[in-house]
C-alpha cells in the first residue's frame, strides 16, 4: 500500500480468483483514543472500533472511503483505491490501446518543433468518475524538470456503438535547447483513477522521435505562361524551429486527381517551391518533414488546381 | 561560442555535400545493423545512449547558430580549444568561432573513425561473420575529414590482446551508430546553416 496523495492510498493486488488479498491497517488521524468507530462509504454499518482498523482487501467491494467517527462527528477519511496486477502485468482497463506505432501504445505524444514543448493524448470509453494526473521529467535516475498542465478532454468521437473520449496534456521542458543532442529520454507518467480503480501509464521518448511539423503555410499557385505547368510555393510553418537554415525541412508535393484511384504524382524537394503539372479538378498538396532526421511527416496543406 | 552570420564566397562549401553523404551512409549502416542484429538490443529504445565525444569535443556548443545564443539553455560552460586551419574555411572573413566549430566536427569524425576501425577489426574475427562496417561509410568519414583538412595528431588505432566478446562488440556497434547518426544530423544542420550564411 502506498499514498497517492493526502488521505488517498493505493492497494496493489495480485488479481486472480480466490486470491488472499492484502491486509491493510488504517489509522484514524486524531488524538482521540476511545469511542472511535469505522464505516465504509455511505453505509452506516460499523466495521470496527478503535483507533486502528485492520481489513483484508481482496476485491473492489473492500475499497472505498473509510471514515472514522466519534459521537457522530467525522474525525478523518482514508480513500482506498485498487491497482490490479494480472499475471505479473499491471492492468490497463481505463485507457484504450491505440496500437500505433505498436501494440500496447496507450499514450501518444507529438512535438511541433525542438523547443521542448510537446503534447500527449490518450483515449478511453469511460465518460464519468474519471481523473488523470500527469508528471514528466527528462531521464529517471537524475530527473530534470518538465512542467505539464492539467489533462483536458480534447475530443469526443462515436466509434460503432461506443463513444470514445480523447484527453490531452501539454508539457514543456524547463530548460530546453533546440539544438541539443538528446541522450536521456523524456518520461511521461499518467495516473488514471476510475471510480476505485487506479492505473498508471508511462511513455518514454526523445523529442527528435516525436517531431511532427505543422503543415507548410501560404501554399500558392502561379500559372506558368503557355504551359499546363504551375509554380507551387509555400513557406515554413510559423511553429517550426528557427533558424530555418539550421532546422531545415524537406517537402513532398503531390498532385491528386478528384478520384482517389487516380495516379498521384509526387515530387520531393528541399526548396519552398516546385513546378508541377496541374490537371483539371486536381488538387496540389504539400507536406513537410525534418530534412535530416526522419520523424513524422506533417499533415498535408492543399489547394485546388482550378 | 556561436556562429556569426558571415557572407561567404560563392561555392565555399564543399563540406555540405560531404556531410549529406555522411548522414545517408550512417543512416543506411544503422538500418542494416538493426536488421542484421534483430536478436540483439539494437533499437533506440533498448540501447544506452552514450556519446564517445562527451567532454572531449563540444560540437553542439561551438556550432550553435547565432540566433540560439540568446537561449541560456544552449550555452554550456564547457571550453575546449582547437587547431584552426581548414579548407572549408574558404573565406578569410570566417570567424574564429566558425573555425572552432569545424575543428570540433573534425575531432568528432576522427574519434568515431578510430572507434569504427577498431570495431571492424574485431568483427572481422567473428566466426559468424554476421556484420561488418560499410566501407562506404568509412570512406565518407574520410572524405569529410579531408574536406575539413585540419592538422591534428593521429590517434593510434586501439589494439586489444584479449579475445573479443562478439556479443558485446555488436551491442557497442549499435550504440556507436545511434550516437554517430545523431552527431551526423548536427553536422548536417551546421553545414546547411554555414552554407546559407
Amino acid at each position: 500500500i502506498w499514498e497517492l496523495k493526502k488521505d488517498v492510498y493505493v492497494v496493489e493486488l495480485d488479481w486472480y480468483p480466490d486470491a488472499p488479498g492484502e491486509m491493510v491497517v488504517l489509522t484514524c488521524d486524531t488524538p482521540e483514543e476511545d469511542g472511535i468507530t469505522w464505516t465504509l462509504d455511505q453505509s452506516s454499518e460499523v466495521l470496527g472500533s478503535g483507533k486502528t482498523l485492520t481489513i483484508q482487501v481482496k476485491e473492489f467491494g473492500d475499497a472505498g472511503q473509510y471514515t472514522c467517527h466519534k459521537g457522530g462527528e467525522v474525525l478523518s477519511h482514508s480513500l482506498l483505491l485498487l491497482h490490479k496486477k494480472e499475471d505479473g502485468i499491471w492492468s490497463t482497463d481505463i485507457l484504450k490501446d491505440q496500437k500505433e506505432p505498436k501494440n500496447k501504445t496507450f499514450l501518444r505524444c507529438e512535438a511541433k518543433n525542438y523547443s521542448g514543448r510537446f503534447t500527449c493524448w490518450w483515449l478511453t470509453t469511460i465518460s464519468t468518475d474519471l481523473t488523470f494526473s500527469v508528471k514528466s521529467s527528462r531521464g529517471s535516475s537524475d530527473p530534470q524538470g518538465v512542467t505539464c498542465g492539467a489533462a483536458t478532454l480534447s475530443a469526443e468521437r462515436v466509434r460503432g456503438d461506443n463513444k470514445e473520449y480523447e484527453y490531452s496534456v501539454e508539457c514543456q521542458e524547463d530548460s530546453a535547447c533546440p539544438a541539443a543532442e538528446e541522450s536521456l529520454p523524456i518520461e511521461v507518467m499518467v495516473d488514471a483513477v476510475h471510480k476505485l480503480k487506479y492505473e498508471n501509464y508511462t511513455s518514454s521518448f526523445f523529442i527528435r522521435d516525436i517531431i511532427k511539423p505543422d503543415p507548410p503555410k501560404n501554399l500558392q499557385l502561379k500559372p506558368l505562361k503557355n504551359s499546363r505547368q504551375v509554380e507551387v510555393s509555400w513557406e515554413y510553418p510559423d511553429t517550426w524551429s528557427t533558424p530555418h537554415s539550421y532546422f531545415s525541412l524537406t517537402f513532398c508535393v503531390q498532385v491528386q486527381g478528384k478520384s482517389k484511384r487516380e495516379k498521384k504524382d509526387r515530387v520531393f524537394t528541399d526548396k519552398t517551391s516546385a513546378t508541377v503539372i496541374c490537371r483539371k479538378n486536381a488538387s496540389i498538396s504539400v507536406r513537410a518533414q525534418d530534412r535530416y532526421y526522419s520523424s513524422s511527416w506533417s499533415e498535408w496543406a492543399s489547394v485546388p488546381c482550378s | 561560442r556561436n556562429l556569426p552570420v558571415a557572407t561567404p564566397d560563392p561555392g565555399m562549401f564543399p563540406c555540405l555535400h560531404h556531410s549529406q553523404n555522411l548522414l545517408r551512409a550512417v543512416s543506411n549502416m544503422l538500418q542494416k545493423a538493426r536488421q542484421t542484429l534483430e536478436f540483439y538490443p539494437c533499437t533506440s529504445e533498448e540501447i544506452d545512449h552514450e556519446d564517445i565525444t562527451k567532454d572531449k569535443t563540444s560540437t553542439v556548443e561551438a556550432c550553435l547558430p547565432l540566433e540560439l545564443t540568446k537561449n541560456e539553455s544552449c550555452l554550456n560552460s564547457r571550453e575546449t580549444s582547437f587547431i584552426t586551419n581548414g579548407s572549408c574555411l574558404a573565406s578569410r572573413k570566417t570567424s574564429f568561432m566558425m573555425a572552432l566549430c569545424l575543428s570540433s566536427i573534425y575531432e568528432d569524425l576522427k574519434m568515431y573513425q578510430v572507434e569504427f576501425k577498431t570495431m571492424n577489426a574485431k568483427l572481422l574475427m567473428d566466426p559468424k561473420r554476421q556484420i561488418f562496417l560499410d566501407q562506404n561509410m568509412l570512406a565518407v568519414i574520410d572524405e569529410l575529414m579531408q574536406a575539413l583538412n585540419f592538422n591534428s595528431e593521429t590517434v593510434p588505432q586501439k589494439s586489444s590482446l584479449e579475445e573479443p566478446d562478439f556479443y558485446k562488440t555488436k551491442i557497442k556497434l549499435c550504440i556507436l551508430l545511434h550516437a554517430f547518426r545523431i552527431r551526423a544530423v548536427t553536422i548536417d544542420r551546421v553545414m546547411s546553416y554555414l552554407n546559407a550564411s
Epitope: 495480485d14 499475471d87 505479473g88 501494440n103 | -
Partner: antibody, heavy 115, light 112 residues
Framework: QVQLVQSGGGVVQPGRSLRLSCAAS????????MHWVRQAPGKGLEWVAF????????YYADSVKGRFTISRDNSKNTLYLQMKSLRAEDTAVYYC????????WGQGTMVTVSS | SYVLTQPPSVSGTPGQRVTISCSGG????????VKWYQQLPGTAPKLLIY???QRPSGVPDRFSGSKSGTSASLAITGVQAEDEADYYC????????????FGTGTKVTVLG
C-alpha cells in the same frame, strides 16, 4: 472454491458450428479475464482466445480469427466459445481458464471435426 | 507455431535431479515472467511455478523454477514416479499480450 464446468463438445462435420460453454462458480466471475486453450490429440497446448472481465476487449489466435467468437454473460457467470466453419485441424480438447498468476482450468471438453 | 522451445523428452531415475529448459526471445521470456505446468494423462494442466520461481501452495518443494535472460528452466530435485507427465512452460509476448505463449512441451519419464 473456484470451479469451471465445461459443456458443449461433441462430433461435428467440417464447415459446421458448435458452441462451448464454461460455467463459473466460487468467485466473482465478472471481475476476471478468461481464456480458451486447446490441445489436439497427442499435441501441445495452444492458446485460442481471451476476453476481458467486462467483455470490452477480445483477442484471438491467428488460426481461429474470423471463425471463432469468445463471449461472456456475467449475469449468468458463463463464458462461451462460438466456433464456426470448423475444420479437421480444430479437433482438440478445449479448456477454459481464468487469467492471473494463479489460474484455474475447466475439466476440458472434446471437439471432434470429422465427416 | 511455437516460439518457446523445450526438449521433447527428458528422463531420470527416482531421486535424480531432472531439468527442463525453455528457450525464448527478448520479446517474451526476456521481458516477461514464466509459468510451468504439469499435465498428467487425460487431465487439465496444473500450475507448478508462476512468476519465474514462485511455487503455489500445495506444490512440493522439489519443483523449482528459474529464469536467465531469454531462457527459463524447471528443476525437479529427487524426481518421483508420480512426476511422470508432460511439462509446459508459458509466457507472454510483449507485442501480443494477453495471448498465452506455450512451450512445445516436454515428456518426463521416470525410469526403473
Amino acid at each position: 472454491q473456484v470451479q469451471l464446468v465445461q459443456s458443449g463438445g461433441g462430433v461435428v462435420q467440417p464447415g459446421r458450428s458448435l458452441r462451448l460453454s464454461c460455467a463459473a462458480s466460487g468467485f466473482t466471475f465478472s471481475s476476471y479475464g478468461m481464456h480458451w486453450v486447446r490441445q489436439a490429440p497427442g499435441k501441445g497446448l495452444e492458446w485460442v482466445a481471451f476476453i476481458r472481465y467486462d467483455g470490452s476487449n477480445k483477442y484471438y489466435a491467428d488460426s481461429v480469427k474470423g471463425r471463432f467468437t469468445i463471449s461472456r454473460d456475467n449475469s449468468k457467470n458463463t463464458l462461451y466459445l462460438q466456433m464456426k466453419s470448423l475444420r479437421a485441424e480444430d479437433t482438440a480438447v478445449y479448456y477454459c481458464k481464468t487469467h492471473g498468476s494463479h489460474d484455474n482450468w475447466g475439466q476440458g471438453t472434446m471437439v471432434t471435426v470429422s465427416s | 507455431s511455437y516460439v518457446l522451445t523445450q526438449p521433447p523428452s527428458v528422463s531420470g531415475t527416482p531421486g535424480q535431479r531432472v531439468t527442463i529448459s525453455c528457450s525464448g526471445g527478448r520479446s517474451n521470456i526476456g521481458s516477461d515472467t514464466v509459468k510451468w505446468y504439469q499435465q498428467l494423462p487425460g487431465t487439465a494442466p496444473k500450475l507448478l511455478i508462476y512468476g519465474n520461481d514462485q511455487r503455489p501452495s500445495g506444490v512440493p518443494d522439489r519443483f523449482s523454477g528459474s529464469k536467465s535472460g531469454t531462457s527459463a528452466s524447471l528443476a525437479i530435485t529427487g524426481v518421483q514416479a508420480e512426476d511422470e507427465a508432460d511439462y509446459y512452460c508459458q509466457s507472454y509476448d510483449r507485442g501480443t499480450h494477453p495471448a498465452l505463449l506455450f512451450g512445445t512441451g516436454t515428456k518426463v519419464t521416470v525410469l526403473g
